[in-house]
């Protein structure tokens, strides 16, 4: 009786069970009941990534310098180009096809996390005691001046976008 | 502008050596399979070998082995081919080429002609 | 190693004419590249994976075949396609690239 389903590494054709293609090699005829599958290997600047069936091999992504992208790891008959993006860049997308300049955090915010080539920066509200008063991909939060340890008082409050105001202690007391 | 820029027209002696070499511009040598083809004149392409600059791994077709060496340098994104023990049927013009992608298509370098005489 | 015939090794045509160059491989490859070469000049990738043309190639040339026989056609030959065009398997080390095809003018 013809099987209906088969093994892994196999597929089903013509009421038989035939090996699937090796990563790296593409199918060019199908097993018969006297031969085996027959694959070829892909060619230079293509690829197949999987156990296959597939009559074409795929061919290496492009890592297009225009679109801000650089290529991390070259492909292999087993695997694709992994692209990047240049510096002060990250990807759109998880394939990254193209890039996009990193955000910068505004006045207010400071950076969580640094952007890499395939995340964008992440920001953050700076808290209480922390300000920020440029627009950076770089900084973080920083604290508010410690007017006491320089024997100074606050004379202007901080806020989220600047630092506190020190000045001299008022002589005058009551 | 991008390319791979070869160096001049060499004249040697037999049993002599001569270096080769293709210098990238405008592109990262680094992403590419270099490829190195003769062609001795008025005949055919030869295909010689293939070095990945990345790492220096090297191919050679049978017939070059040993005759021929191919080295990278990335931080100069130039690759070398050096011939040895030069011979008169080593006279031919020496070709670099890189692997293509969809959309760069290979370049080709402008070629280095070889002489080989006593 | 592969050993890679092209045919015929010369021709001469005249502008309009349609073109055939066959390429046979001594054992199955998996793609054919092909190549064209003008006197003096670098040579340049026309068609790549059997029958993709390359950016700025015109569409007069075409690639087909499969297994160890390939074919490039032109469909009507051009003044400026008069050169020598090669065919190059890089499926198996060593890479092999015919004897190539010399068109001339008739």
């Known amino acids: 009786e013809p099987p209906t389903a088969c093994r892994e590494k196999q597929y089903l054709i013509n009421s038989q069970c035939c090996s699937l293609c090796q990563p790296g090699q593409k199918l060019v005829s199908d097993c018969t009941e006297f031969t085996e599958t027959e694959c070829l290997p892909c060619s230079e600047s293509e690829f197949l990534d999987t156990w296959n069936r597939e009559t074409r091999c795929h061919q290496h992504k492009y890592c297009d310098p225009n679109l801000g992208l650089q290529v991390q790891q070259k492909g292999t008959s087993e695997t694709d180009t992994i692209c990047t993006c240049e510096e002060g860049l990250h990807c759109t997308s998880e394939s990254c096809e193209s890039c996009v300049p990193h955000r910068s955090c505004l006045p207010g915010f400071g950076v969580k996390q640094i952007a890499t080539g395939v995340s964008d920066t992440i920001c953050e509200p700076c808290p209480v005691g922390f300000f920020s008063n440029v627009s950076s991909a770089f900084e973080k939060c920083r604290p508010w001046t410690s007017c006491e340890t320089k024997d100074l008082v606050v004379q202007q409050a901080g806020t989220n976008k600047t630092d506190v105001v020190c000045g001299p202690q008022d002589r005058q007391r009551a | 502008q991008v390319q791979l820029v070869q160096s001049g027209a060499e004249v040697k002696k037999p049993g002599a050596s001569v270096k080769v070499s293709c210098t990238a511009s405008g592109f990262n040598i680094k992403d590419y399979y270099v490829h190195w083809v003769k062609q001795a004149p008025g005949q055919g392409l030869e295909w010689m070998g293939r070095i990945d600059p990345e790492d220096g791994d090297s191919k050679y077709a049978p017939k070059f082995q040993g005759k021929a060496t191919m080295t990278a340098d990335t931080s100069t994104s130039t690759v070398y081919m050096e011939l040895s023990s030069l011979r008169s049927e080593d006279t031919a013009v020496y070709y670099c080429?890189?692997?293509?992608?969809?959309?760069?298509?290979?370049?080709w370098g402008q070629g280095t002609l070889v002489t080989v005489s006593s | 190693d592969i050993q890679m015939t092209q045919s015929p090794s010369s021709l001469s045509a005249s502008v309009g004419d349609r073109v055939t160059i066959t390429c046979s491989a001594s054992?199955?490859?998996?793609?054919m590249l092909w190549f064209q070469q003008k006197p003096g000049k670098a040579p340049k990738l026309l068609i790549y994976?059997?029958?993709n043309l390359a950016s700025g190639v015109p569409s007069r040339f075409s690639g087909s075949g499969s297994g160890t026989d390939f074919t490039l056609t032109i469909s009507s030959l051009q003044p400026e396609d008069f050169a020598t065009y090669y065919c190059q398997q890089r499926t198996f080390y060593p890479y092999t690239f015919g004897g190539g095809t010399k068109v001339e003018i008739k």
């Open positions: 080429t890189t692997s293509y992608y969809v959309g760069t298509y290979g370049y």
């Open positions: 054992s199955s490859v998996s793609y």
């Open positions: 994976s059997t029958s």
